[in-house]
């Protein structure tokens, strides 16, 4: 038996998320350790509830003096996690979120992991590698993605409502076939998620099923529903 409800069928189409780690091979050596400060900034969408690993620039361990992770989250004081190689000492300042940790001991691996990613982890993460040749930076603008909950129902005569609830960022809704649609409504929640609602009407009585297609960075979903007969439309002419 199908798990799909009888007339309303949901689907996850194509998931478009990047992998959970953008780490390069740590054995890579930064070319000719120039005195110029190397600054790399990466925008990175990560799905909520997954794990993420953020990496430092690929600097040889023997050239390191200090590794510092700076974490700037909305509405919170800046958190720093640092490791001094000379003393093998780690230090934390203003870091209260236990889900953000070193992958292992910093002398083994300088990567930072978020396990699991929560909506509050939206923010800027920067690794600073201090070496005798200068400081090397890698920054991440982490955008936490939240998959919207999608519903479709017929509200009244040949009028359907499709909702993409609490997504981040806002989802986009389209219809097959095109209907007579009211302007899309958006409701913003305090946690940064958005509910998108689209209401459409189909006058043509030859329209049998309508499909709501929801596009989102976490993947696309489509649902369809067979429209009910208009009350009073008893039988078609024979």
């Amino acid at each position: 038996q199908s798990n799909n409800s009888l007339m309303l069928q949901t689907s996850k189409e194509n998931h478009t998320l990047a992998s959970n780690s953008l780490c390069m091979d740590e054995k890579q050596i930064t070319q000719n350790h120039s005195k110029v400060l190397a600054e790399v900034n990466i925008s990175w969408p990560v799905q909520m509830a997954r794990n993420a690993v953020l990496c430092c620039p690929p600097i040889e361990f023997r050239n390191l003096i200090v590794i510092t992770w700076e974490i700037i989250l909305r509405g919170q004081p800046s958190c720093t996690k640092s490791y001094r190689k000379e003393t093998n000492e780690t230090k934390e300042t203003n870091c209260t979120d236990e889900r953000i940790t070193w992958v292992s001991t910093p002398d083994q691996n300088s990567d930072l992991q978020i396990h699991p990613v929560a909506i509050t982890h939206d923010g800027y993460y920067r690794c600073i590698m201090a070496t005798p040749d200068g400081n090397f930076h890698r920054g991440y603008h982490l955008q936490v993605l939240v998959t919207p909950e999608v519903t479709l129902f017929e509200s009244r005569n040949r009028t359907a409502v499709c909702k993409a609830v609490a997504g981040k960022p806002a989802a986009q809704i389209s219809w097959i076939p095109a209907g007579d649609c009211a302007p899309t409504e958006q409701e913003y929640w305090g946690n940064g998620t958005v509910t998108v609602k689209s209401t459409c009407h189909w006058e043509g009585h030859n329209v049998s099923t309508v499909t709501c297609h929801v596009s989102h960075l976490t993947g696309n979903k489509s649902l369809y529903i067979e429209l009910l007969p208009v009350p009073g439309a008893k039988k078609s002419a024979k």
């Epitope: 009888l6 689907s11 194509n14 076939p177 309508v210 499909t211 007969p229």
Partner: antibody, heavy 114, light 107 residues
Framework: QVQLQQPGSELVRPGASVKLSCKAS????????MHWVKQRPGQGLEWIGN????????NYDEKFKSKATLTVDTSSSTAYMQISSLTSEDSAVYYC???????WGQGTLVTVSA | DVQMIQSPSSLSASLGDIVTMTCQAS??????LNWFQQKPGKAPKLLIY???NLEDGVPSRFSGSRYGTDFTLTVSSLEDEDMATYFC?????????FGGGTKLEIK
């Protein structure tokens, strides 16, 4: 578990009528459209029409408007299709289907023969 | 009525092959579509609903895709049990219309 039960076969005379049944179970019969589909031996599938059991509303393909009549008995959760003025062209397997074509009956083979 | 043009009408392939068949909606109509497998003497079995979604219990070697009003069913690694006739169905407009079918034979 959604099930649509149809009798296996019907043998009928040319010019007569036949009433095919489709007994539904495992879901709310009155809330979902029931569709009927024809398949001639070795041929493709043709949509005949549909009925909404909650109101009795029907739609027919133009080709079948004077040939088929769809009805329901909500007390027994059964959909019916009556085919009239039978000819050899009506010899086919007839299926009922619901759930936007997710669920199908096993089909009834109608043979029109003198 | 929306016509569904299905091609090819038949194809022969070897075990392990990748096979594709297509359905095209007439007049560039925007529709939604399901794919079915039918074996002799049996009712059609839903494989793909909403053009791209695998029905529960259907092997993952079956997949559907859409490009505008062109729809494709792909079987990624043909098996003996896939020998059957495949149909598409557009269910957006009444009357519902089926493709003419693709008969898949194993070489």
């Amino acid at each position: 578990q959604v099930q649509l039960q149809q009798p296996g076969s019907e043998l009928v005379r040319p010019g007569a009528s036949v009433k095919l049944s489709c007994k539904a179970s495992g879901y709310t019969f009155t809330s979902y459209w029931m569709h009927w589909v024809k398949q001639r031996p070795g041929q493709g599938l043709e949509w005949i029409g549909n009925i909404y059991p909650g109101s009795g509303t029907t739609n027919y393909d133009e080709k079948f408007k004077s040939k088929a009549t769809l009805t329901v008995d909500t007390s027994s959760s059964t959909a019916y299709m009556q085919i009239s003025s039978l000819t050899s062209e009506d010899s086919a397997v007839y299926y009922c289907t619901t759930g936007t074509s997710t669920y199908w009956g096993q089909g009834t083979l109608v043979t029109v023969s003198a | 009525d929306v016509q569904m043009i299905q091609s090819p009408s038949s194809l022969s392939a070897s075990l392990g092959d990748i096979v594709t068949m297509t359905c095209q909606a007439s007049q560039g109509t925007s529709i939604n579509l399901n794919w079915f497998q039918q074996k002799p003497g049996k009712a059609p079995k839903l494989l793909i609903y909403g053009a791209v979604n695998l029905e529960d219990g259907v092997p993952s070697r079956f997949s559907g895709s859409r490009y505008g009003t062109d729809f494709t069913l792909t079987v990624s690694s043909l098996e003996d049990e896939d020998m059957a006739t495949y149909f598409c169905l557009q269910h957006t407009y009444l009357p519902w219309t089926f493709g003419g079918g693709t008969k898949l034979e194993i070489k």
